[in-house]
Structure formats: structure tokens, C-alpha cells
């Protein structure tokens, strides 16, 4: 068997609602990932887990389950969304989130994602993570790529 | 450290115009809007208006409008607020603000300048 | 624009009284994020305008848990639980919600 390809591409949109009286904010993430199928046979993209993190607690977790099928040398983007939650110990940045001063609130969150994979009765999963930044002030459609963070460390947070 | 130094006191002409300065330290000035506001002698404050030192984009009260022109100079970290045709009623103090972000905790501070104090007078 | 009208213009009170001020907007200062950006603010004589409150009740970092903020809609409220001496002031609401921006006419506490 050859290989299948999966490239996370990025953030395509972040959705953004607020409880005012628990101080809590609530993200819609959508993403979006490029799977390709390197075979001369189709493949079945079983499910796909993510789970998001900000400063290094998981705010957000989904799994979507039998997806599609990827049909010989071929490529499918999926979009898949997360909802989030920042609250309780991380109320704080509701303020941050809502604050007029500001006109963009990046925060840097970590994506995870795992890709399940069948064919012929074989799974395989493929993993990525990478750091995006989102901005928890408003509702925004990104470029695909445009929400990288680039710093390879771990941000301060 | 997160700070906002404003010039220093005018004394200046009825008809003449006059530009303060709002010089910020421990932040970029292109990351948030710029406010100005005014306190008249034994009187309230007067929200004047903000900037967006970024694109220069400005907003006004419109009892400001045609009197006040905000601009901003992100190179030197410096916002601007220039007075037109001064009357006695532009004799107040004139203070900058914004509120940042000072650390990498994402949390916030309000931020004033000490306040430049205008006089017109004949 | 929104009118910020503030109750009563001057306000004496003992020290370790109770101090509340009013404050009422002439139109609702919902934000379209669903905030209410309504602050208040001690000015002292030769002093930079200091923040209390934000956000109706949030207070702001260092200031005394004696200061409490209250309301909705259009009224709202500032009190003071027991007054000290370093309260004394001018006190202004402001609206951050709706530009222009505006602020309350003030409210000056002082000694009875």
C-alpha cells in the first residue's frame, strides 16, 4: 500500500458567542484538512477525532465518524468543526475576548487532529497538531493558511 | 513598562492652533485604538474621540468635529491630537488612554497619560 | 448620541457611610457583541481618570471590594460600602458601547 496524505490547512472560519453572566466564550472552529490517497484503490475515511487547546488545557473535542470514501490517486478537503468553551479557570480571558480597545483578539490555540483510515479491513491513523491563531472578538472567515502561528515554541500563555 | 507621556502645558492665542502629543511606551500603538479626552476647568469629562494609529482611520463626538484632528505616527509609537482655532472653551486638560494588554497572561490595564493642560488666552 | 445621565450632582457622606450613585443612559448600551460596556471612573484633582468598573460589575484589577457595580438595560448603579477617605472624588459612568462614546455629567463625593 502507498501512502495517505493528510495535511491540516488551516482555520476557514471561527464562529464566536459570549455568556455575559458566566464571563464564558463560546468558539465555533471550523477546519479544514486535505486527505489524499495515494492508491490505486479506494479508501475510507472511517473518522476523524480533534480536540483544541489553549494553554494546555483541551477546551474543545469532536469526532465525525464515516465520512467519506476516496476514490484511486484522489484528494477530498473536509471540513470539520470543534465547538470550544473558555471558561471557569480561564474566565480571565473574557476580558481580553471582549475588550473594545482592541481591534483584533488573536489567541494561539493548538489544533489536534487524528485521521482513521480503512481499506481492505486495514485502519490506519495519521495525527497532526499544529498552533493557529483564532480571534475570540468576532465572527471571521480566514484565507486558508492565514490563521498559522509560525513560532515553533510554545507560546506564552 | 506599559506607560503614556504626554507633552507638556501650552499657553497659546484665541485663533491659533495648537498639536499634543501622546507618546506610548511598553505596547505598539498600531495594536489598539487611541482615545482622547477632555476635562474643562470645574467641569466633566468630554470623550473626544478615537484613532486607529494603523490606518489613521478617526472617529468624533460630533461636538469635536471640524475642531480636533486625531492622526497618529506608529514609527514613534505617538498619537496626536491638534486643536483649531482656539477659543477660551479649549482651555481644559487633554488626556490620552487606551487599555492594553501587559503581559502574556492576556491580562488587561487602563492606560491614561498625565494629562496636557491648554490655555488660551489673549 | 447616547445622553449619560448621572444622580445626584453631589453626594456628602460620613466616612464608613454607604455611597450609591446612579447613572441612566438615554438608550439601551448593548453592544452588538451582547456586552454592556458600562464603566465608571474615579477622577481626583490633578490625577488621570482611574477605572473602577467595567462591563456593568466587573471590577477592575486592584480596586477595593467596597466598590460594587449594578444594573441593566438603562439604570445602573455604583455603591460604595463603607466610604474612605482616599473615595473622595468625582465619579463618572461612561458608555463604551455606541460611538461617540460618552460620559456621565459626574457625581462628586464629598465629606457631609
Known amino acids: 500500500p502507498r501512502s495517505i496524505d493528510v495535511k491540516y490547512i488551516g482555520v476557514k472560519s471561527a464562529y464566536v458567542s459570549y455568556d455575559v453572566q458566566k464571563r464564558t466564550i463560546y468558539l465555533n472552529i471550523t477546519n479544514t484538512l486535505n486527505i489524499t490517497n495515494n492508491n490505486y484503490y479506494s479508501v475510507e475515511v472511517e473518522n476523524i477525532t480533534a480536540q483544541v487547546q489553549f494553554s494546555k488545557t483541551v477546551i474543545g473535542k469532536a469526532r465525525l465518524n464515516n465520512i467519506t470514501i476516496i476514490g484511486p490517486l484522489d484528494m477530498k478537503q473536509i471540513d470539520y468543526t470543534v465547538p470550544t468553551v473558555i471558561a471557569e479557570e480561564m474566565s480571565y480571558m473574557y476580558d481580553f475576548c471582549t475588550l473594545i480597545s482592541i481591534k483584533v483578539h488573536n489567541i494561539v490555540l493548538m489544533m489536534q487532529v487524528t485521521v482513521t483510515t480503512t481499506y481492505f479491513g486495514h485502519s490506519e491513523q495519521i495525527s497532526q497538531e499544529r498552533y493557529q491563531y483564532v480571534d475570540c472578538g468576532r465572527n471571521t472567515t480566514y484565507q486558508l493558511g492565514q490563521s498559522e502561528y509560525l513560532n515553533v515554541l510554545q507560546p506564552q500563555q | 513598562e506599559v506607560q503614556l507621556q504626554q507633552s507638556g502645558a501650552e499657553l497659546m492665542r484665541p485663533g491659533a492652533s495648537v498639536k499634543l502629543s501622546c507618546t506610548a511606551s511598553?505596547?505598539?500603538?498600531?495594536?489598539?485604538?487611541m482615545y482622547w479626552v477632555k476635562q474643562r476647568p470645574e467641569q466633566g469629562l468630554e470623550w473626544i474621540g478615537r484613532?486607529?494609529?494603523?490606518?489613521?482611520?478617526?472617529e468624533y463626538a460630533p461636538k469635536f468635529q471640524g475642531k480636533a484632528t486625531m492622526t497618529a505616527d506608529t514609527s514613534s509609537n505617538t498619537a496626536y491630537l491638534q486643536l483649531s482655532s482656539l477659543t477660551s472653551e479649549d482651555t481644559a486638560v487633554y488626556y490620552c488612554?487606551?487599555?492594553?494588554?501587559?503581559?502574556?497572561?492576556?491580562?488587561?490595564?487602563?492606560?491614561w497619560g498625565q494629562g496636557t493642560s491648554v490655555t488660551v488666552s489673549s | 448620541d447616547v445622553l449619560m445621565t448621572q444622580i445626584p450632582l453631589s453626594l456628602p457622606v460620613s466616612l464608613g457611610d454607604q455611597a450609591s450613585i446612579s447613572c441612566r443612559s438615554s438608550?439601551?448600551?448593548?453592544?452588538?457583541?451582547?456586552?454592556?460596556?458600562l464603566e465608571w471612573y474615579l477622577k481626583k484633582p490633578g490625577q488621570s481618570p482611574k477605572l473602577l468598573i467595567d462591563?456593568?460589575?466587573n471590577r477592575f484589577s486592584g480596586v477595593p471590594d467596597r466598590f460594587s457595580g449594578s444594573g441593566s438595560g438603562t439604570d445602573f448603579t455604583l455603591k460604595i460600602s463603607r466610604v474612605e477617605a482616599e473615595d473622595l472624588g468625582v465619579y463618572y459612568c461612561?458608555?463604551?458601547?455606541?460611538?461617540?462614546?460618552?460620559f456621565g455629567g459626574g457625581t462628586k463625593l464629598e465629606i457631609k
Open positions: 488612554s487606551t487599555r492594553v494588554i501587559y503581559d502574556g497572561y492576556y491580562r488587561t490595564m487602563d492606560c
Open positions: 511598553g505596547f505598539n500603538i498600531q495594536d489598539y485604538y
Open positions: 484613532i486607529d494609529p494603523e490606518d489613521g482611520d478617526a
Open positions: 438608550q439601551t448600551i448593548v453592544h452588538s457583541n451582547g456586552n454592556t460596556y
Open positions: 462591563k456593568i460589575s
Open positions: 461612561f458608555q463604551g458601547s455606541h460611538v461617540p462614546y460618552t
